[in-house]
């Protein structure tokens, strides 16, 4: 009685169950009543990451330096190459097929989270008591200078873009 379903890591062909090829190998020929499935290793720069019956291996991803990409992890016969972006850039998608320059936080905004190879800079508005007077991908909002601790008084109030200006206290005559 020919099988209608096969075990895990097998497939049904010509009324018989054949073993799938292991990760890193491709199918050359189905099994027969005399021999097992014929599988061969993927070539250099190729991979298959699952038990399979593929007749061709997949090409490793190319990390194109013209797109700002570099290799984060070299591919094997069982895994694809993982790309990431050059310093100062981040991936435009989860697949990391191209890179864009990290965003800078404008004056009045500070860096909440520094960008990584896969995520952009996260900016936040400087709250009261803090300021940022530069456009930067690294600078956080800085606290206003405390005039009091320097025995000075505020001569000009700070904003989210400027620090306070301190000056000497008026002397009592």
């Amino acid at each position: 009685e020919p099988p209608t379903a096969c075990r895990e890591k097998q497939y049904l062909i010509n009324s018989q169950c054949c073993s799938l090829c292991q990760p890193g190998q491709k199918l050359v020929s189905d099994c027969t009543e005399f021999t097992e499935t014929e599988c061969l290793p993927c070539g250099e720069s190729e991979f298959l990451d699952t038990w399979n019956r593929e007749t061709h291996c997949h090409q490793h991803k190319y990390c194109d330096p013209n797109l700002g990409l570099r290799v984060q992890q070299k591919g094997t016969s069982e895994t694809d190459t993982i790309c990431t972006c050059e310093e100062g850039w981040h991936c435009t998608s989860e697949a990391c097929e191209s890179c864009v320059l990290h965003r800078s936080c404008s004056p009045g905004f500070g860096v909440k989270q520094i960008a990584t190879g896969v995520s952009d800079t996260i900016c936040e508005p400087c709250p009261v008591g803090f300021f940022s007077n530069v456009s930067s991908a690294f600078e956080k909002c800085h606290p206003w200078t405390s005039c009091e601790t320097k025995d000075l008084v505020v001569q000009q109030a700070g904003t989210n873009k400027t620090d306070v200006v301190c000056g000497p206290q008026d002397r009592l005559r």
């Epitope: 199918l27 050359v28 020929s29 189905d30 021999t35 014929e38 061969l40 070539g43 007749t55």
Partner: antibody
Framework: QVQLVQSGAQVKKPGSSVKVSCKAS????????ISWVRQAPGQGLEWMGM????????SYAQKFQGRVTMTRDTSTSTVYMELSSLRPEDTAVYYC????????WGQGTLVTVSS | QSALTQPPSASGSPGQSVTISCTGT?????????VSWYQQHPGNAPKLIIY???KRPIGIPDRFSASKSGNTASLTVSGLQADDEADYYC??????????FGGGTKLTVLG
């Protein structure tokens, strides 16, 4: 059970081409590669190349690169091996076989190259 | 791709054992566990008797056994019979969708 039946013997002149066919029956044609092997009189086996019928992709031994072409016709479950610029030393029995493992063989086709 | 190296001939008496070697390189026999052995009687197509270094197709008697060490594969025929007299060829996958054969060994059964 896969069976491979090859075309008949041929006599060719030097400089000409020969095309040998290999018709497969039994099994699923697109699910196994076909290798071509030749054997000159009194000599050993020589692997010429292979074709993957599912996509038609080929791989040829370096020695035959540029002179051999392997094709397939899925409608008739037939693969072909064409060898061009024949010379007398190409006189041999040409076999098709299933896969790289070559677990099933055709009966062989004698190609004689003679002026 | 150079041919794998086999002794041109081997012999033994009925009932004895004979071993045939097949020496390649670290790019073929040594690199992959995809060595096959074939038996060819005169006037016939070759017949697969061993694949994947040591596996026998169903129907091939266990008198035929094989192994591999480093860059050399070996076929042993034990309990020699008159019908074992034939040519024996090894082959190995050599990477990049290439295959290479040995030069062949003529096995003679004496007596």
């Amino acid at each position: 059970q896969v069976q491979l039946v090859q075309s008949g013997a041929q006599v060719k002149k030097p400089g000409s081409s020969v095309k040998v066919s290999c018709k497969a029956s039994g099994g699923t044609f697109s699910s196994y590669a076909i290798s071509w092997v030749r054997q000159a009189p009194g000599q050993g086996l020589e692997w010429m190349g292979m074709i993957n019928p599912s996509g038609g992709t080929t791989s040829y031994a370096q020695k035959f690169q540029g002179r051999v072409t392997m094709t397939r016709d899925t409608s008739t479950s037939t693969v072909y091996m064409e060898l061009s610029s024949l010379r007398p030393e190409d006189t041999a029995v040409y076999y098709c076989a299933r896969g790289f493992r070559m677990d099933q063989w055709g009966q062989g086709t004698l190609v004689t190259v003679s002026s | 791709q150079s041919a794998l190296t086999q002794p041109p001939s081997a012999s033994g008496s009925p009932g004895q054992s004979v071993t045939i070697s097949c020496t390649g390189t670290s790019s073929d026999v040594g690199a992959y566990n995809f060595v096959s052995w074939y038996q060819q009687h005169p006037g016939n197509a070759p017949k697969l008797i061993i694949y994947d270094v040591r596996k026998r197709p169903i129907g091939i008697p266990d008198r035929f056994s094989a192994s591999k060490s480093g860059n050399t594969a070996s076929l042993t025929v034990s309990g020699l019979q008159a019908d074992d007299e034939a040519d024996y060829y090894c082959s190995s996958y050599a990477g990049n969708n290439n295959l290479v054969f040995g030069g062949g060994t003529k096995l003679t059964v004496l007596g």
